[in-house]
C-alpha cells in the first residue's frame, strides 16, 4: 500500500519535477525580461534603481559550487514570495502609468504564483520543510511620487530578473547532482 493519505508523496523521479520547475522558471524569466524591456522603453530608467524592501540576491558565481537543494528551494521560494508581494503592490499602488502595463503585470503575477505552487509541491515531494521567512514581512509603504513608483517598478523587475536567472542556473546545477 502507498503512503497514508495526507502525507507528502515522494516523487519517483525528482529530476522530472526539477525539470518542470526549471521550465516554469525559464518561462517567467522570459516574461520578466520582456516586461523590463517594455518598462525601459516606455519609462526610460536613469541609472540603476534599488528598493530596500527587496530581498538581497541569494546566489552568485562564487556560491554556485556549494549549493544544496533544500537551501536553494527554501530561499528561492521565500524570495519569490517577496517579489510576488511587490508585484501585487505595483499593480495596486503604482499609479496610472503602470496601469498601461496592467495585462502584462497581471500575467507576470499569475506566472509567479504558478511557479510558487510548483516549488511548494516540489518541496513537499522531496519531504523538505516549508520554511517560513526569517524576517517579519514589512508592509510596503505608499510610493512617494509617480516617478518613485516607476523607479520601484524598474528595481522590482530588475531584481526579479536577476533572481530568476540565478535560479535557473542553480536548479540546473542541482539536477546534475541528484
Amino acid at each position: 500500500p502507498g503512503p497514508p493519505a495526507g502525507s507528502p508523496r515522494v516523487s519517483s523521479d525528482p529530476r522530472a519535477d526539477l525539470d518542470s520547475a526549471v521550465l516554469l522558471t525559464r518561462s517567467l524569466l522570459a516574461d520578466t525580461r520582456q516586461l523590463a524591456a517594455q518598462m525601459r522603453d516606455k519609462f526610460p530608467a536613469d541609472g540603476d534603481h534599488s528598493l530596500d524592501s527587496l530581498p538581497t540576491l541569494a546566489m552568485s558565481a562564487g556560491t554556485l559550487g556549494s549549493l544544496q537543494l533544500p537551501g536553494v528551494l527554501t530561499r528561492l521560494r521565500v524570495d519569490l514570495m517577496s517579489y510576488l508581494r511587490h508585484v501585487q503592490w505595483l499593480r495596486r499602488a503604482g499609479g496610472p502609468s503602470l496601469k498601461t502595463l496592467e495585462p502584462e503585470l497581471g500575467a507576470l503575477q499569475a506566472r509567479l504564483e504558478r511557479l510558487l505552487r510548483r516549488l511548494q509541491l516540489l518541496m513537499s515531494r522531496l519531504a523538505l520543510p516549508q520554511a517560513a521567512p526569517d524576517q517579519p514581512v514589512i508592509p510596503l509603504g505608499p510610493p512617494a511620487s509617480a516617478w518613485g513608483s516607476i523607479r520601484a517598478a524598474h528595481a522590482i523587475l530588475g531584481g526579479l530578473h536577476l533572481t530568476l536567472d540565478w535560479a535557473v542556473r542553480g536548479l540546473l546545477l542541482l539536477k546534475t547532482r541528484l
Epitope: 516606455k42 499609479g95 502609468s97 512617494a144 511620487s145 509617480a146
Partner: antibody, heavy 117, light 111 residues
C-alpha cells in the same frame, strides 16, 4: 509648501472652448501625476482626467473623452485642461490635484466654469 | 449615478462614533486602494484616508478607514461639530480606466 492654483475659469457659451491652467509650486512637479476633478454646483465630485508625470500617459472620463485634452509643461510647472465643445453639463468648479499613486494628496482651490447662453 | 455607493446622509451627536460605508465592485474597491476625502462647506476636498487605512499627517486619529472585499468604510469616533462636512470615497477602476468617486455622504452633527 505645496501649492496648486487654478485659473482660466469663467462664463462661456455652449459649443465654445476654454483652457484652464494650474500653476504648481513647493514640490518637484515633474515627479507627480496630476488630475483634474470637477464638482457641479450642489453635486458630488467627478473625476475628469489624469496625466502621468512624464506626460505620455493620459486617461479621461467617458463624459469628456474626445472634447477635453489634459497636458502639462514640466518646465513651467503648469498643468492644463483644454475644454472644447462645452456643454451646459460641464458647468462646475474645476480642481487640479496632485497624486503620488491613486489618491489626491493636495488640491487647488478650484476655478468656476459656467457654460451658459 | 455614482460607481461607488455611499449613503447620502449620516448623523450623530458630539462624542458619538459614526461609520460611513462605500460599496463598489471587483474592478475598483476589490482590486485597488480606497481613499477618503472631507469637504467642508465652500472649500476644496481634503485627503483623510489613503491606501485603505492610512492617515496623512495632521489628520486626527479619530478618523479611521477599513476595507473588506468590495466595500470600504470610514469611521469617525468622538464626533465633533467641526466634522460636519461632505465625505467622499474614491478608488481607481480597472474597467473604466479612471478614478471613481462615491456620491458623497453629508454628515450632520446634531445638538
Amino acid at each position: 509648501q505645496v501649492q496648486l492654483v487654478e485659473s482660466g475659469g469663467g462664463v462661456v457659451q455652449p459649443g465654445r472652448s476654454l483652457r484652464l491652467s494650474c500653476a504648481a509650486s513647493g514640490f518637484t512637479f515633474s515627479h507627480y501625476d496630476m488630475h483634474w476633478v470637477r464638482q457641479a454646483p450642489g453635486k458630488g465630485l467627478e473625476w475628469v482626467a489624469v496625466i502621468s508625470y512624464h506626460g505620455s500617459v493620459k486617461f479621461y472620463a467617458d463624459s469628456v473623452k474626445g472634447r477635453f485634452t489634459i497636458s502639462r509643461d514640466n518646465s513651467k510647472n503648469t498643468l492644463y485642461l483644454q475644454m472644447n465643445s462645452l456643454r451646459a453639463e460641464d458647468t462646475a468648479v474645476y480642481y487640479c490635484a496632485r497624486t503620488p499613486g491613486f489618491h489626491f494628496d493636495y488640491w487647488g482651490q478650484g476655478t468656476l466654469v459656467t457654460v451658459s447662453s | 449615478q455614482s460607481v461607488l455607493t455611499q449613503p447620502p446622509s449620516a448623523s450623530g451627536t458630539p462624542g458619538q462614533r459614526v461609520t460611513i460605508s462605500c460599496s463598489g465592485s471587483s474592478s475598483n474597491i476589490g482590486s485597488n486602494y480606497v481613499s477618503w476625502y472631507q469637504q467642508l462647506p465652500g472649500t476644496a476636498p481634503k485627503l483623510l484616508i489613503y491606501y485603505d487605512d492610512l492617515r496623512p499627517s495632521g489628520v486626527p486619529d479619530r478618523f479611521s478607514g477599513s476595507k473588506s472585499g468590495t466595500s470600504a468604510s470610514l469611521a469617525i469616533s468622538g464626533l465633533r461639530s467641526e466634522d460636519e462636512a461632505d465625505y467622499y470615497c474614491s478608488a481607481w477602476d480597472d474597467s473604466l480606466s479612471g478614478v471613481v468617486f462615491g456620491g458623497g455622504t453629508k454628515l450632520t452633527v446634531l445638538g
